[in-house]
C-alpha cells in the first residue's frame, strides 16, 4: 500500500471511466488510470480506502491500466482516485473521479411547463417528481454541456431554464438521488422543441436516443474535481 511522503514528485495520473461515469446497477464499468511508461504499479482508491492494484507487465510498454468493476452497486459508487509508482517514487493523487450508480428503487416523472414545444425566448421550467423521498434531483440533457445548479428538497424539483435559446433544444431525463452517487432509475425522456427565430429549429436533435450509453460525457476531471462536460444539472428543491 502506498506510503504518504512529502516527496511525491511524480506528476499526477489522469483517471476516467468508460463507458460512462453513470453506471446502471449491476452493470460493469472500466476505470482507466494513465500515468507513466515507467510505472511499475498503479493503485486505485475508493472513498479513501485501498481498492485495487495493477502491476503492468514489463513486456507491455503501456502508460495506462484498466481497473474493471464487474458489477456496479451502491457499495461501489463514490469517489475514486489513483496513484502510480515509478522506481521508489509515488505520484500525486489523480483528480477525483465520481462514479454514480443509477437504476435504484424508483422512477421519477419528468414534465416541462408550459409544453414541450415552445417558441424562442419563451420561459420554460422542467419538473421532476419522485414518490420516494429524496433530497436531490438531477436533470440531464443528452449530448449536453456542463451546467450545474443546486437546491434542496423532498419529492419534487423545479428546473427553471429561463428564456430558451436553440441551445436548450434536446432530450432530457431526470433522476432522484438517495445520496450523491446513488440515483434512481431515469425518467422517461422529454424532448424540448424550439420554434421561431431566424431559422426554424423545431427539429429534435439529430440522432436522439433513449440509451444512456449514447450520452456524451467527458469523463476526465478538472482541477476543482468536478466532472467536465458531465451534462447534468444538480438540483434540489427547498420546501
Amino acid at each position: 500500500q502506498r506510503i504518504n511522503t512529502e516527496k511525491e514528485t511524480l506528476p499526477k495520473p489522469i483517471i476516467w471511466a468508460k463507458p460512462s461515469i453513470m453506471v446502471t446497477n449491476g452493470n460493469s464499468v472500466n476505470i482507466w488510470c494513465q500515468g507513466a511508461q515507467s510505472a511499475s504499479e498503479y493503485q486505485l482508491y475508493f472513498e479513501g480506502s485501498f481498492f485495487a492494484l495493477e502491476r503492468p507487465k514489463p513486456s507491455r510498454s503501456m502508460n495506462k491500466v484498466r481497473f474493471f468493476i464487474s458489477q456496479m452497486t451502491s457499495h461501489t459508487a463514490g469517489i475514486y482516485t489513483c496513484f502510480y509508482q515509478s522506481g521508489e517514487l509515488w505520484s500525486k493523487s489523480s483528480n477525483p473521479l465520481k462514479l454514480v450508480v443509477t437504476g435504484l428503487y424508483d422512477t421519477p416523472n419528468l414534465w416541462v411547463y408550459p409544453r414541450p414545444e415552445v417558441t424562442l425566448g419563451e420561459n420554460v421550467t422542467f419538473f421532476c417528481q419522485l414518490k420516494t423521498a429524496t433530497s436531490k434531483f438531477f436533470l440531464l440533457k443528452e449530448r449536453g454541456s456542463n451546467h450545474i445548479q443546486n437546491k434542496y428538497g423532498n419529492i419534487q424539483a423545479e428546473f427553471p431554464m429561463g428564456p430558451v435559446t436553440r441551445a436548450h433544444r434536446g432530450t432530457y431525463r431526470c433522476f432522484g438521488s438517495y445520496n450523491d452517487y446513488a440515483w434512481s432509475f431515469p425518467s422517461e425522456p422529454v424532448t424540448l422543441l424550439i420554434t421561431g427565430g431566424v431559422e426554424n429549429s423545431s427539429l429534435a436533435p439529430t440522432d436522439p436516443t433513449s440509451s444512456l450509453d449514447y450520452w456524451e460525457f467527458d469523463l476526465s476531471t478538472n482541477e476543482s474535481g468536478l466532472q467536465k462536460d458531465s451534462a447534468f444539472w444538480d438540483h434540489t428543491t427547498q420546501n
Epitope: N30, F46, S49, F50, F51, A52, L53, E54, R55, P56, K57, V65, R66, F67, F68, I69, S70, Q71, T73, H75, T76
Partner: nanobody, 126 residues
Framework: EVQLVESGGGEVQPGGSLRLSCAAS????????MGWFRQAPGKGREFVAA???????YYAESVKGRFTISRDNAKNTLYLQMSSLRAEDTAVYYC????????????????????WGQGTLVTVKP
C-alpha cells in the same frame, strides 16, 4: 452463477499451519480475480490476500511472510496456506471472486467482489 465453497478450517495451536481451499463451480474460474477475507468475532471483515488472473499476488501487512495465496485453474480451486499461526488469526475465513475481471487486476476492497463463500472457521489456541 459462481458458487464458492471453503474447506480446511479447524483448530490449531499457535505456530501451527493450515491450508484452506476454496472450490469454485463453473468454467469462469480462470477468468476470475480471487481473494481471501476474514472476520474475527465482534469485528468487521478484513482483507487477507488476493490473486489476479495471472497469479500476481498481494497480502495484508499482518499476514505477509506467513500466508501464501495460490490458485489451480485446472482444479477450479483457490488456496490459502497459513503458517506461523497466531491467536489473532482466529476468524471465519471467506473466499471471494470478481467475475469477470480484466488483465492483472488485484482487488483489495471487499466491495469489488461479487461472489462470496459461506466461510470456514479457523481457531488458533493453545
Amino acid at each position: 452463477e459462481v458458487q464458492l465453497v471453503e474447506s480446511g478450517g479447524g483448530e490449531v495451536q499457535p505456530g501451527g499451519s493450515l491450508r484452506l481451499s476454496c472450490a469454485a463451480s463453473g468454467r469462469t474460474f480462470a477468468s476470475a480475480a480471487m481473494g481471501w477475507f476474514r472476520q474475527a468475532p465482534g469485528k468487521g471483515r478484513e482483507f487477507v490476500a488476493a490473486i489476479s488472473r495471472s497469479d500476481d499476488t498481494y497480502y495484508a501487512e499482518s499476514v505477509k511472510g506467513r500466508f501464501t495465496i495460490s490458485r489451480d485453474n485446472a482444479k477450479n480451486t483457490l488456496y490459502l496456506q497459513m503458517s506461523s499461526l497466531r491467536a489473532e488469526d482466529t476468524a471465519v475465513y471467506y473466499c471471494a471472486a470478481v467475475v469477470p475481471t480484466y488483465g492483472n487486476n488485484i482487488y483489495v476492497h471487499s466491495a469489488a467482489y461479487n461472489y462470496w463463500g459461506q466461510g470456514t472457521l479457523v481457531t488458533v489456541k493453545p
